[in-house]
Amino acid sequence: KKVVLGKKGDTVELTCTASQKKSIQFHWKNSNQIKILGNQGSFLTKGPSKLNDRADSRRSLWDQGNFPLIIKNLKIEDSDTYICEVEDQKEEVQLLVFGLTANSDTHLLQGQSLTLTLESPPGSSPSVQCRSPRGKNIQGGKTLSVSQLELQDSGTWTCTVLQNQKKVEFKIDIVVLAFQKASSIVYKKEGEQVEFSFPLAFTVEKLTGSGELWWQAERASSSKSWITFDLKNKEVSVKRVTQDPKLQMGKKLPLHLTLPQALPQYAGSGNLTLALEAKTGKLHQEVNLVVMRATQLQKNLTCEVWGPTSPKLMLSLKLENKEAKVSKREKAVWVLNPEAGMWQCLLSDSGQVLLESNIKVLPTW
């Protein structure tokens, strides 16, 4: 018996061939011997089966001795043995229809779980293998689960169902809802303008939700809500904003905030959360602000940084075009009685300068 695998919702074509290459009488029946369709001369006739409105044939092939049964919009319950009767012969074809669906929405928040469920006909024992967009393979039976979805899991998942040495392939598009970056760090000299950007890693036509930026300043004992906003059809509207600092927020995506100037009291870490309509859970992005200040007070030249710096970062003070006078893995360095000239304060990571501030020391007469 020939086995054909079909996909729920798809169309399948079961073949039936006569030895004579001409139009002769044929009938397609199901395992209960109920007629599905056949012919009467050049006319297609249909029987009382449940497939009535979804069954068809190709009249153009009848003259060549081919009498296919076409079933549209396949359902799991269409799984059956179909019998083609032609020239006193019976050709049997076993049709097995499978469906593969994501148990929830195909738009999932980063960190959530994806469960794929296989619908299969009674008596079948299929195996399923899925390949994620990042090339990760998962195997299972009736259900497959992936916990802790990552950004790289966004895209087309290709799943292969195997049954009776035959296979059928499903493609499911999964969108992982997340910010492009989990964390970002902004380095600024005191007084410079600060821009924070929170680009999303997905695009949808209508995006609705609400968000908030909480800020933990290094100098403060507790965190503070800097801004709350709504998102409606991709348009941002600010609901409440702190008066210090004087934040501005762009009205369109990507989410974007500006501070008029970087000050030591603003240095610290923020957490922007975005709750999307009809989704449980929130998207998060951490943002960090490091602020540098170089000052000269009497005979002391000081360079300081505030904010979340890694212990391996190096803070240096050097006279332009000369070797560093002082270099430490600390948040403040100073030089007593500095020579006249242009001094540079540098914050660097393995030789790469992250932040630089220049200060001119005048000669003392």
Epitope: Q193, V194, E195, D230, K232, N233, E235, S237, V238, Q248, M249, G250, K251, K252, H256, T258, P260
Partner: antibody, heavy 119, light 107 residues
């Protein structure tokens, strides 16, 4: 082609009210954010008020906050500006402008309607 | 509100000249700035949007650029029809704000 046509301007006494209308043709009104912009005689352009495409969010310049109200009627494809407690400094040509779908810029403007506040 | 400082307020130039007008924003506004041209008795029309994108139908002699919070409108070779008043508009956030305008006159 998208067209905007303002109406409702005229002479009004200080403290009085006027309602400006902006009829739009050739577009699905609810898709786009809209704004009112004014220009006092011999002066520059001043943004007055804006409304989101959904009509849910409205915004105002500080100079008109509490006195002007922007609304829209999607079924009539019309934008309105209700102006109360009018002052001499509100005298201007009032333009309505449509914003782009993906961008904020004002890509279509009406010809303007003149409001004169004088006793 | 975000302040837009436009300069110069007026400018005399000749046909064929290269002209630049600048706007400075008091806050970072990304590329969310447009340049508009207005002729006497007429409504403004957009020339440049998103700081540097040329509006459809606008001659290529008009161009826009951004450096941080400084924005520039350049007319590479002035034509007689370019004598008008030019405004920048920040559409980053509400309330939107225009620059004070630059009146471009024939020398």
């Amino acid at each position: 082609e998208v067209e905007l046509l303002e109406s409702g301007g005229g002479l009004v006494q200080p403290g009085g009210s006027l309602r400006l209308s902006c009829a739009a043709s050739g577009l699905t009104f609810s898709t786009f954010a809209m704004s009112w912009v004014r220009q006092a005689p011999g002066k520059g352009l001043e943004w007055v008020s804006g409304i989101s495409g959904s009509g849910e969010n409205t915004y105002y310049a500080d100079s008109v906050k509490g006195r002007f109200t922007i609304t829209s009627d999607n079924s009539k494809n019309t934008l309105y500006l209700q102006m109360n407690s009018l002052r001499a400094e509100d005298t201007a040509v009032y333009y309505c402008a449509k914003e782009g779908y993906n961008w904020n810029y004002m890509d279509v403007w009406g010809k303007g309607t003149t409001v004169t506040v004088s006793s | 509100a975000i302040q837009m400082t436009q300069s110069p307020s007026s400018l005399s130039a000749s046909v064929g000249d290269r002209v630049t007008i600048t706007c400075r924003a008091s806050h970072g506004i990304r590329n969310d700035l447009g340049w508009y041209q207005q002729k006497p008795g007429k409504a403004p029309k957009v020339l440049i949007y998103e700081a540097s994108s040329l509006q459809s139908g606008v001659p290529s002699r008009f161009s826009g650029s951004r450096s941080g919070t400084d924005f520039t409108l350049t007319i590479s070779s002035l034509q007689p029809e370019d004598f008008a008043t030019y405004y920048c508009l920040q559409d980053y956030t509400y309330p939107y704000t225009f620059g004070q305008g630059t009146k471009l006159e024939i020398k």
